[in-house]
């Protein structure tokens, strides 16, 4: 199976406006397993936001094709769920169906592995992407998205689950990583920092971006998320870095303008359908891919991560709105909801483009240490 190669979105990365800035491809020290990352306080080995503990196996699973949307794997961030954090409840995800509070939080007790043993796995997410060490895989074709341009009706559920803000997606959003690798989008959520502190989950050569969007998908080979958890390729997440740009991002504004309505943990609102693909970079051909896990408990592995090389630009005001509007449990701001980067432990990040060829003057010659492990499926 092919290791996802993550393409770094270089801090300079061009926004979805069209600039495509590859994450920096400097020749960094091997991206292997050293987590080398400054994690925000208390985010040590936190749960990945992708594994929505209480959202994945959500009780609110709906009937086929719809259930996807219901499961919100990315019950994100940083908030600590009520309940006895000490009891490692397996269902630390979310106590009940609409209740996205899991018994875990960013940075603090209980340790995630106690909440879900999988969080101590060897192939966890997020990771630091080092373009110079990524394996160029020509077989990685442009991503294909179908049905992502949603009409205003029916409206979608936007919820503050105490860990992140999550948008539940309706049936019909299809995504293909390549031939025979088809998925259905279930939900999307964001990870962010705080005033003056970046909060992306993945990093590029140690650089953390202001924020990151995750669109979680379920393989068409599975009818339910709980069946796909832990299965190689059962879940796939499209991730993109959000950066500050000079203009307001109209697509994101459709969501950000509604955050005030869900300021409280557990609150939700309905928003008109929108073009979900507009929330992602425009270049679907340049990305990094690797196999990892959900970034929040249950931290299930086997998740295929696709990280766009191009970034998405939001205005400074929009980034502030994202980090300053929502509240988590205990009168604490919902911020810094990202997990620390995890060791690669031998995994190779693949790139759909020659990311290791550094165009900057620093590198005398291209350094492409890893080779593409899987040309096909």
């Amino acid at each position: 199976q092919r290791l996802p190669r993550m393409q770094e979105d270089s801090p300079l990365g061009g926004g979805s406006s069209g600039e495509d800035d590859p994450l920096g491809e400097e020749d960094l020290p091997s991206e292997e397993d050293s987590p080398r990352e400054e994690d925000p306080p208390g985010e040590e080995d936190l749960p990945g936001e992708e594994d929505l503990p209480g959202e994945e196996d959500l009780p609110e699973v709906k009937p086929k094709s719809e259930e996807e949307g219901s499961l919100k794997l990315e019950d994100l961030p940083t908030v600590e769920a009520p309940g006895d954090p000490q009891e490692p409840q397996n269902n630390a995800h979310r106590d009940k169906e609409g209740d996205d509070q899991s018994h875990w939080r960013y940075g603090g007790d209980p340790p995630w592995p106690r909440v879900s043993p999988a969080c101590a796995g060897r192939f966890q997410s997020p990771v630091d992407i080092r373009p110079q060490l990524a394996a160029f895989c020509p077989a990685l074709r442009p991503l294909e998205l179908l049905g992502f341009q949603l009409p205003p009706l029916p409206e979608l559920r936007l919820r503050n689950n105490g860990h992140s803000v999550q948008l539940t997606l309706p049936p019909g959003l299809e995504m293909a990583l390549g031939p025979g690798r088809e998925y259905r989008a279930l939900q999307l959520h964001l990870h962010w920092g705080a005033a003056g502190r970046p909060g992306s989950e993945h990093t590029v050569e140690g650089h953390r971006f202001p924020a990151e969007i995750h669109v979680v998908h379920l393989s068409t080979a599975f009818a339910r998320v709980d069946e796909a958890l832990g299965r190689p390729g059962g879940l796939a997440v499209l991730a993109a870095f959000l950066e500050e740009g000079p203009e307001e991002n109209s697509a994101y504004e459709q969501l950000l303008s509604r955050l005030e309505e869900i300021a409280e943990e557990g609150s939700e609102t309905q928003v008109p359908g929108l073009d979900i693909s507009a929330l992602l970079p425009s270049d679907f051909s340049r990305y990094f891919q690797y196999e990892g896990s959900l970034t929040t408990p249950p931290c299930a592995q086997g998740v295929i991560w696709t990280v766009f090389n191009q970034t998405v630009m939001l205005s400074a005001k929009q980034l502030h709105t994202l980090s300053d509007t929502l509240w988590g449990p205990g009168d604490s701001r919902l911020q810094l909801n990202f997990r620390a980067t995890q060791p690669l432990n031998g995994r190779v990040i693949e790139a759909s483009f020659p990311a290791g060829v550094d165009s900057s003057p620093r590198a005398a010659e291209p350094v492409q240490l890893n080779s593409c492990l899987a040309a096909g499926d």
């Epitope: 705080a194 005033a195 502030h320 300053d324 009168d331």
Partner: antibody, heavy 119, light 107 residues
Framework: ELVESGGGLVQPGGSLRLSCAAS????????MSWVRQAPGKGLEWVSG????????YYADSVKGRFTISRDNSKNTLYLQMNSLRAEDTAVYYC??????????????WGQGTLVTVSS | DIQMTQSPSSLSASVGDRVTITCRAS??????LSWYQQKPGKAPKLLIY???NLQSGVPSRFSGSGSGTDFTLTISSLQPEDFAVYYC?????????FGQGTKVEIK
């Protein structure tokens, strides 16, 4: 500009409704708060409301007795005060917060209106 | 609630002096701190927000610094109109809370 009104003398247990008329900015884009200052004392946040009025917050000392509301069509903020106590005596200021939310710095303040609770 | 402690509670200074007021939070508030100036019978006026950002229209002699739990308001050269009471406010946690105030008087 923010202009408060509605203050006055009221007996313990009584009620009063304060208003804050806003002008010169897009009222519906900002969170608003009421902050009070007892004679010779410091500032105490009382209540806040988000820009669209969807979220309201109260200090424990007034919870259940005071109600904050806003009418964006009239560019006006309100504070309904019931079951007033002597310790509620203070100058009440309305303040615009620096964002649509309620817990931010107050970048514009009214001149204040005095509320005196005494028998 | 997060407690904000200002020091000193009062100080006497002369025009032209450099004045420093400190504010300490009972827990980390990142840079969610603002400073206000209040003169007798008047409403508070925002000077600094985000710990170090100068509010529009405020003289550059006012500056703020700090992050986490310790913050400072500095008036580089005290002017006659600066004699007033200064308050810090944290808006990181709920409810927002103010320091008890520091009165700057003429020596």
């Amino acid at each position: 500009e923010l202009v408060e009104s509605g203050g006055g003398l009221v007996q313990p247990g009584g009620s009063l409704r304060l208003s804050c008329a806003a002008s010169g900015f897009t009222f519906s884009s900002y969170g608003m708060s009421w902050v009070r200052q007892a004679p010779g004392k410091g500032l105490e946040w009382v209540s806040g409301i988000s820009s669209l009025g969807s979220t309201t917050y109260y200090a424990d000392s007034v919870k259940g007795r005071f109600t904050i509301s806003r009418d964006n069509s009239k560019n006006t903020l309100y504070l309904q005060m019931n079951s007033l106590r002597a310790e509620d005596t203070a100058v009440y200021y309305c303040a615009r917060t620096g964002s649509p939310g309620t817990f931010m710095h107050g970048d514009h303040w009214g001149q204040g209106t005095l509320v005196t609770v005494s028998s | 609630d997060i407690q904000m402690t200002q020091s000193p509670s009062s100080l006497s200074a002369s025009v032209g002096d450099r004045v420093t007021i400190t504010c300490r939070a009972s827990q980390d508030i990142n840079n969610y701190l603002s400073w206000y100036q209040q003169k007798p019978g008047k409403a508070p006026k925002l000077l600094i927000y985000g710990a170090s950002n100068l509010q529009s229209g405020v003289p550059s002699r006012f500056s703020g610094s700090g992050s986490g739990t310790d913050f400072t308001l500095t008036i580089s050269s005290l002017q006659p109109e600066d004699f007033a009471v200064y308050y810090c406010q944290q808006y990181y946690g709920r409810p927002t809370t103010f320091g008890q105030g520091t009165k700057v008087e003429i020596k």
